[in-house]
């Protein structure tokens, strides 16, 4: 009886179960009754990352410097090239096909997580007791100055964008 289903890492063709090509190799010719599947390695600029019956290997991704991209990990015959973004930029999508500059956190917001090549800056509002008076991709919210530790008093209350203003204590009798 000709098979209707094949084992793992096989495929059915012309009533025969043929071996799939291993990762890093492409199909040249299907197996026959007397011969095994013929596979050939992908060339240096190509890859296939699964057991397959592909007749063409996939081209490695090109990390285009004009789009701010650079190689994070060189591709092999079994893996694609992984691109990342140059300093100060991050990927616009999971597939990292282009880059944009990191976002800066506006005054009143601080950096919760510094951007990487693949993720943007994460900002958070400065909570009570903290402020940020700059637009920055690196600066966290800073705590208000503690006037008491300087033997001073608060002359002007702080906000999420401004520090407190300290002044001398009134020397009243």
């Amino acid at each position: 009886e000709p098979p209707t289903a094949c084992r793992e890492k096989q495929y059915l063709i012309n009533s025969q179960c043929c071996s799939l090509c291993q990762p890093g190799q492409k199909l040249v010719s299907d197996c026959t009754e007397f011969t095994e599947t013929e596979c050939l390695p992908c060339s240096e600029s190509e890859f296939l990352d699964t057991w397959n019956r592909e007749t063409r290997c996939h081209q490695h991704k090109y990390c285009d410097p004009n789009l701010g991209l650079q190689v994070q990990q060189k591709g092999t015959s079994e893996t694609d090239t992984i691109c990342t973004c140059e300093e100060g930029l991050h990927c616009t999508s999971e597939s990292c096909e282009s880059c944009v500059p990191h976002r800066s956190c506006l005054p009143g917001f601080g950096v919760k997580q510094i951007a990487t090549g693949v993720s943007d800056t994460i900002c958070e509002p400065c909570p009570v007791g903290f402020f940020s008076n700059v637009s920055s991709a690196f600066e966290k919210c800073r705590p208000w100055t503690s006037c008491e530790t300087k033997d001073l008093v608060v002359q002007q209350a702080g906000t999420n964008k401004t520090d407190v203003v300290c002044g001398p204590q009134d020397r009243q009798r």
Epitope: E1, C31, T32, F34, T35, E36, E38
Partner: antibody, heavy 123, light 107 residues
Amino acid sequence: EVQLVESGGGLVQPGGSLRLSCAASGFTFSDYYMSWVRQAPGKGLEWVGFIRNKANAYTTEYAASVKGRFTISRDNSKNTLYLQMNSLRAEDTAVYYCARYGGLRQGWYFDVWGQGTLVTVSS
Amino acid sequence: DIQMTQSPSSLSASVGDRVTITCRASQDIRNYLNWYQQKPGKAPKLLIYYTSRRDSGVPSRFSGSGSGTDYTLTISSLQPEDFATYFCQQGKTLPWTFGGGTKVEIK
């Protein structure tokens, strides 16, 4: 011991018929493809045809030079392979070998041979 | 059909000699190449299958190599019992075809 023994060879006139037999022993006959190979006197080897195993419905394949004239069959209950030769020609004169065809897709080969039986086609 | 061309058709050698027989296919046979030994009045005997795999019981002095269309049978040190005719056979595509044979004779 794995063994193949041919019989049935002899002298036959052009246009005549002959049936060769090959008795197999020492292995599970129905599991194997079985083949006939011939060798004209002082010449090289020529594949004649084969019959597939039970799993492949005992279907047959033939060389172009004998297709339509020769028929390969088998009787698995008797562990015997046959070659029915009709419309014989002078060029069919040869020693006929029965051979077991073995292996996997990483190389098939004739791994067991009989001693051969001579067929002479002459008037 | 795939044509198999063996060379030389015959050779003379002495015991202990290294002997090389070549077989050329008319197209790529992807290593599906077998070698047989035949002595006068006897049936052929399988020596090597799939280019380089020795059949059980075949002495290690017999070795096979090659790829694509060109294949070689080597006898590293010829023994008296090795004087015989050697045939190659392709097993890639029907009809199976044999080389014309190489007769190894005593010098």
